[in-house]
């Protein structure tokens, strides 16, 4: 057992080294480890094959370090890994697209507060078991096409607190099991009419605190299971172009936030849902 760590065998073989001031992944981690806790240290780099010997590893925590680089092969051989927490590593900024390849059993991936500026092509390829994906509080500006395509079992996708400016047509392709999509506190000004086409099981959609002045109801049509919708804190323009959204909200059986109008001036602060159809005039 490495000097700064505590190792024990029950109920899972565990190597626990949190908050020890470690500057590197310690050598001598027992190969039988099923759980490795390395959070709260000063580790800046995860070299290739750091945990290759740990074939039985199911939980790996590296959150709250100072990670600036993770080698593409850092997690090679971890076919049984279920939970990987890399959050709170603000200097990370980017992750090689091959980093998570081979993690076919992974069900929870924490990448929040990592300073991520982009999601490289194929970053989440093959993560068929993933259920929870934490990407909030990064610096993401775009959602590339098919980024999440392989995540057919994903139920929770947290993308809030980024700098995303639009939701393109293929951004959420393949997310057939998604239950919660949190996109609040971004800069979203445009949602493609087919952006939510695969989200037939979505129950919660947060779009509040964005830059939306309009939302095509065609985008909302596929959301058959939607129960909770938040659209507040957007610069909604309540003219004739808002009529389709107004009509959709009248029919919506679930629970929704207020949709306060920004323009025209005479309707500023009024809730779109509570307006009459003939209030929505002038284009």
């Amino acid at each position: 057992c490495p000097g700064a760590c505590v190792c024990y065998n029950e109920p899972k073989v565990t190597t626990s080294c949190p908050q020890q001031g470690l500057q590197a992944v310690p050598v001598g981690i027992p190969a039988a480890s099923q759980r490795i806790f390395l959070h709260g240290n000063r580790i800046s780099h995860v070299p290739a094959a750091s945990f290759r010997a740990c074939r039985n590893l199911t939980i790996l925590w590296l959150h709250s370090n100072v990670l600036a680089r993770i080698d593409a092969a850092a997690f090679t051989g971890l076919a049984l890994l279920e939970q990987l927490d890399l959050s709170d590593n603000a200097q990370l900024r980017s992750v090689d697209p091959a980093t998570f390849h081979g993690l076919g059993r992974l069900h929870t991936l924490h990448l929040d507060r990592c300073g991520l500026q982009e999601l490289g092509p194929g970053l989440f390829r093959g993560l068929a078991a993933l259920q929870y994906l934490y990407l909030q509080d990064n610096a993401l500006q775009a959602l590339p096409d098919d980024t999440f395509r392989d995540l057919g079992n994903l139920t929770h996708l947290f993308l809030h607190g980024n700098r995303i400016s639009s939701v393109p047509e293929r951004a959420f392709r393949g997310l057939h099991s998604l239950d919660r999509l949190l996109l609040h506190q971004n800069r979203v000004a445009h949602v493609h009419p087919h952006a939510f086409r695969d989200l037939g099981r979505l129950m919660t959609l947060y779009l509040f605190a964005n830059n939306l002045s309009a939302l095509p109801t065609e985008a909302l049509a596929p959301l058959r299971a939607l129960q909770y919708l938040r659209l507040n804190d957007n610069p909604w323009v309540c003219d004739c172009r808002a009529r389709p959204l107004w009509a959709w909200l009248q029919k919506f059986r679930g629970s929704s936030s207020e949709v306060p109008c920004s323009l025209p001036q005479r309707l500023a602060g009024r809730d779109l849902k509570r307006l009459a159809a003939n209030d929505l005039q002038g284009c």
Partner: antibody
Framework: EVQLVESGAEVKKPGASVKVSCKVS????????MHWVRQAPGNGLEWMGG????????KHAQKFQGRVTMTEDTSTDTAYMELSSLRSEDTAVYYC????????????WGKGTLVTVSS | YVLTQPPSVSEAPGQRVTISCSGG??????VNWYQQLPGKAPTLLIY???VLTSGVSARFSGSRSATSASLAISGLQSEDEADYYC???????????FGGGTQLTVL
């Protein structure tokens, strides 16, 4: 900082129902996994039920099956627990508690709501 | 209670005390420890058997054996007087199971 703020104390008659609310602030309810735990006067903690991330369903302790309803309104960041057919032994402090990181621990707790059942 | 804890323990200030948790499915489950100060809500101290919650004093520590878990508190202080509960998520019951609680008195 995440806080769970519960509704005020309630006094109920036997046979009645009570609905306790739990409002999330500093975070959104959709990010949390919510549970309910109660504590009768002078007794220990007793889990009533909560969201099971693996199945995506709300699970209840066998003891409360059919009497408890747990709901969430993520549009207002409020969770609710309703207990029906109240009896005197349901007198307790009712806590909402949440798992913030999907780590399998109840790491945020409300201050609790005292429910008194008395005729 | 399915999980067994000593009902009470007491020790002098500055000393070390250990609270055990056994029974039920402790042998195959990860244990969490909660502290409940008088008149307050519980707070999480330790999860995954040994991992200390952020902000909790390093005087608290968790340990494991094949059939039980233990919470140790060293350098006892008067503000440690509280009830301490162990808990597991029991996969067979699909439920959180709590121990009966241990009342710690600092003499």
């Amino acid at each position: 900082e995440v806080q769970l703020v519960e509704s005020g104390a309630e006094v109920k008659k036997p046979g009645a129902s009570v609905k306790v609310s739990c409002k999330v602030s500093g975070d959104t309810l959709a990010e949390l996994t919510m549970h309910w735990v109660r504590q009768a006067p002078g007794n220990g903690l007793e889990w009533m039920g909560g969201y099971d991330p693996e199945s995506g369903e709300t699970k209840h302790a066998q003891k409360f099956q059919g009497r408890v309803t747990m709901t969430e309104d993520t549009s207002t960041d409020t969770a609710y627990m309703e207990l029906s057919s109240l009896r005197s032994e349901d007198t307790a402090v009712y806590y909402c508690a949440a798992d913030r990181r999907h780590w399998g621990s109840l790491d945020v707790w409300g201050k609790g709501t005292l429910v008194t059942v008395s005729s | 209670y399915v999980l067994t804890q000593p009902p009470s323990v007491s020790e002098a200030p500055g000393q070390r005390v250990t609270i055990s948790c056994s029974g039920g499915n402790v042998g195959s489950s990860s244990v969490n420890w909660y502290q409940q100060l008088p008149g307050k809500a519980p707070t999480l101290l330790i999860y995954y058997d040994t991992v200390l919650t952020s902000g909790v004093s390093a005087r608290f520590s968790g340990s494991r054996s094949a059939t039980s878990a233990s919470l140790a508190i060293s350098g006892l202080q008067s503000e440690d007087e509280a009830d301490y509960y162990c808990a597991i998520w029991d996969d067979s019951l699909n439920a959180w199971v709590f121990g009966g609680g241990t009342q710690l008195t600092v003499l």
